[in-house]
C-alpha cells in the first residue's frame, strides 16, 4: 500500500492548525511543562516491517482524535479550528485503515506490534492523566498541545521513511 | 543545517528607535521559538522575550515591557526585535536565539551572530 | 523574577584540569537549568540542558549536575578551546534569567 502524498500533507496541514489552536502563551505555561516520555523507538521505521509502522501510525492518529474529540477538549479550543483539525486526522484514520487492511494480508503482525500499540497506548494515558490531574486548565492544554504537535512530527517523519522504503 | 542571520550594526540617538532582523533558515519556521537576548558591553546575558510566530503573540520580560516588540514574519521567515525611547544603557550587542522545534520554549539552542546597536548623541 | 548567582566570577587553570562551576538559584526550578559557553566576540554555545543533558556534538568532558536550588558544570579536563566565559540559565519561569558569568582564564 502506497501512503498518498496527500497523507503526508494532512499531516502537515494538522500540525499547521494544532498550532494555531493555541491559546496562551507557551512562554507563560512553563512550570507546567511535563514529560510525558514519547515512545520515540516506535516511530523508529527502520526497525519495523510496513504492516507495523501503518498500524503505530493509526494507533497514534487514532488516540490523538479521541484526545481532541472529548468534551473537555471542545471547551478548550476554538471550534472551528478543533473541527478543521480533527477532519484532517478523521481523513488520515480512513488512508491508514485502507493501508492496514492491505498490508496486513501480506505481512503477519507479529506480537512486537501489540507492545508498540501498547506503548501508544500508555503514553495517551500519561497525558490523559496529566489533564485530569491539573483540572484541565488552559496550561495543561497547551502543554498538551505542544505535545502532539511533537508526536504528530515524529509520525510526519515515519511516513517519509515509509515513503522512502516502498 | 539551521542558521539564524541578523542585520547590520546601527548606531542610534538617544531616544530613537531601531528594529533589528533575524532570518532564519532550516525547519520550519512557524513552529518553532525565537527569542531575543542581549549583552551589554563586558555585561552578561539578559533575555528580553520571544515569540513563537505560528502561535502569534509574544512574550516580554517585565524590565522591557512597554519599550520592545518582538514580531515575526512567516512569509520571510524572518523575527524582528524593536526596542523604542533607547538610552545609552541600551548600547549591546542583540542576539536572535532559535529554540527547539515543537519543544518549550526554554533552552536556546541555535544563535544569530549578534547585531551591535550604540546608543550615542 | 528568579535570581541566578555564580561562582566563582572568574578562575585561572591550566590545561588538563579538573574545572567546577558552580550556579544558585534563589528558589527551587526543579532541573530546568541550561550552561552556555561563550568566546569573546562570538555567540553563546549551548553545551547542557535539563541540569545535566549533554548537548549534541559538545566533548563528553563538560558534565552537569544538581536540582532544586544548586547546581554544577564540570569540565573534568581543560583543554586549550575551553577558555571562554561559561553562563547559567534558568527556564524554570519566565522571565528567562542567566549567572553574571564565569570566566575561565590560562594560568
Known amino acids: 500500500c502506497d501512503l498518498p502524498q496527500t497523507h503526508s500533507l494532512g499531516n502537515r496541514r494538522a500540525l499547521i492548525l494544532l498550532g494555531q489552536m493555541g491559546r496562551i502563551s507557551p512562554f507563560s505555561c512553563l512550570k507546567d511543562r511535563h514529560d510525558f516520555r514519547i515512545p520515540q523507538e516506535e516511530f523508529d521505521g527502520n526497525q519495523f516491517q510496513k504492516a507495523q509502522a501503518i498500524s503505530v501510525l493509526h494507533e497514534m492518529i487514532q488516540q490523538t482524535f479521541n484526545l481532541f474529540s472529548t468534551e473537555d477538549s471542545s471547551a478548550a479550543w476554538e471550534q472551528s479550528l478543533l473541527e478543521k483539525f480533527s477532519t484532517e486526522l478523521y481523513q488520515q484514520l480512513n488512508d491508514l485503515e485502507a493501508c492496514v487492511i492491505q498490508e496486513v494480508g501480506v505481512e503477519e503482525t507479529p506480537l512486537m506490534n501489540e507492545d508498540s500499540i501498547l506503548a501508544v497506548r500508555k503514553y495517551f494515558q500519561r497525558i490523559t492523566l496529566y489533564l485530569i490531574e491539573r483540572k484541565y486548565s488552559p496550561c495543561a492544554w497547551e502543554v498538551v498541545r505542544a505535545e502532539i504537535m511533537r508526536s504528530l512530527s515524529f509520525s510526519t517523519n515515519l511516513q517519509k521513511r515509509l515513503r522512502r522504503k516502498d | 543545517q539551521v542558521q539564524l542571520v541578523q542585520s547590520g550594526a546601527e548606531v542610534k540617538k538617544p531616544g530613537s528607535s531601531v528594529k533589528v532582523s533575524c532570518k532564519a533558515s532550516g525547519g520550519t519556521f512557524s513552529s518553532y521559538a525565537i527569542s531575543w537576548v542581549r549583552q551589554a558591553p563586558g555585561q552578561g546575558l539578559e533575555w528580553m522575550g520571544g515569540?513563537?510566530?505560528?502561535?502569534?503573540?509574544?512574550n516580554y520580560a517585565q524590565k522591557f515591557q512597554g519599550r520592545v516588540t518582538i514580531t515575526a514574519d512567516e512569509s520571510t521567515s524572518t523575527a524582528y526585535m524593536e526596542l523604542s525611547s533607547l538610552r545609552s544603557e541600551d548600547t549591546a550587542v542583540y542576539y536572535c536565539?532559535?529554540?527547539?522545534?515543537?519543544?518549550?520554549?526554554?533552552?536556546?539552542?541555535?544563535w544569530g551572530q549578534g547585531t551591535l546597536v550604540t546608543v550615542s548623541s | 523574577d528568579i535570581q541566578m548567582t555564580q561562582s566563582p566570577s572568574s578562575l585561572s587553570a591550566s590545561v588538563g584540569d579538573r574545572v567546577t562551576i558552580t550556579c544558585r538559584a534563589s528558589?527551587?526550578?526543579?532541573?530546568?537549568l541550561n550552561w552556555y559557553q561563550q568566546k569573546p566576540g562570538k555567540a553563546p554555545k549551548l553545551l547542557i540542558y535539563?541540569?545535566?543533558s549533554l548537548q549534541s556534538g559538545v566533548p563528553s568532558r563538560f558534565s552537569g549536575s544538581g536540582s532544586g536550588t544548586d547546581f554544577t558544570l564540570t569540565i573534568s579536563s581543560l583543554q586549550p578551546e575551553d577558555f571562554a566565559t561559561y553562563y547559567c540559565?534558568?527556564?524554570?519561569?519566565?522571565?528567562?534569567?542567566f549567572g553574571q558569568g564565569t570566566k575561565v582564564e590560562i594560568k
Open positions: 540559565q534558568q527556564s524554570y519561569s519566565t522571565p528567562l534569567t
Open positions: 528558589q527551587s526550578i526543579s532541573s530546568y
Open positions: 535539563f541540569a545535566s
Open positions: 515569540i513563537i510566530p505560528i502561535f502569534g503573540t509574544a
Open positions: 536565539a532559535r529554540h527547539l522545534e515543537y519543544a518549550f520554549p526554554d533552552k536556546f539552542d541555535y
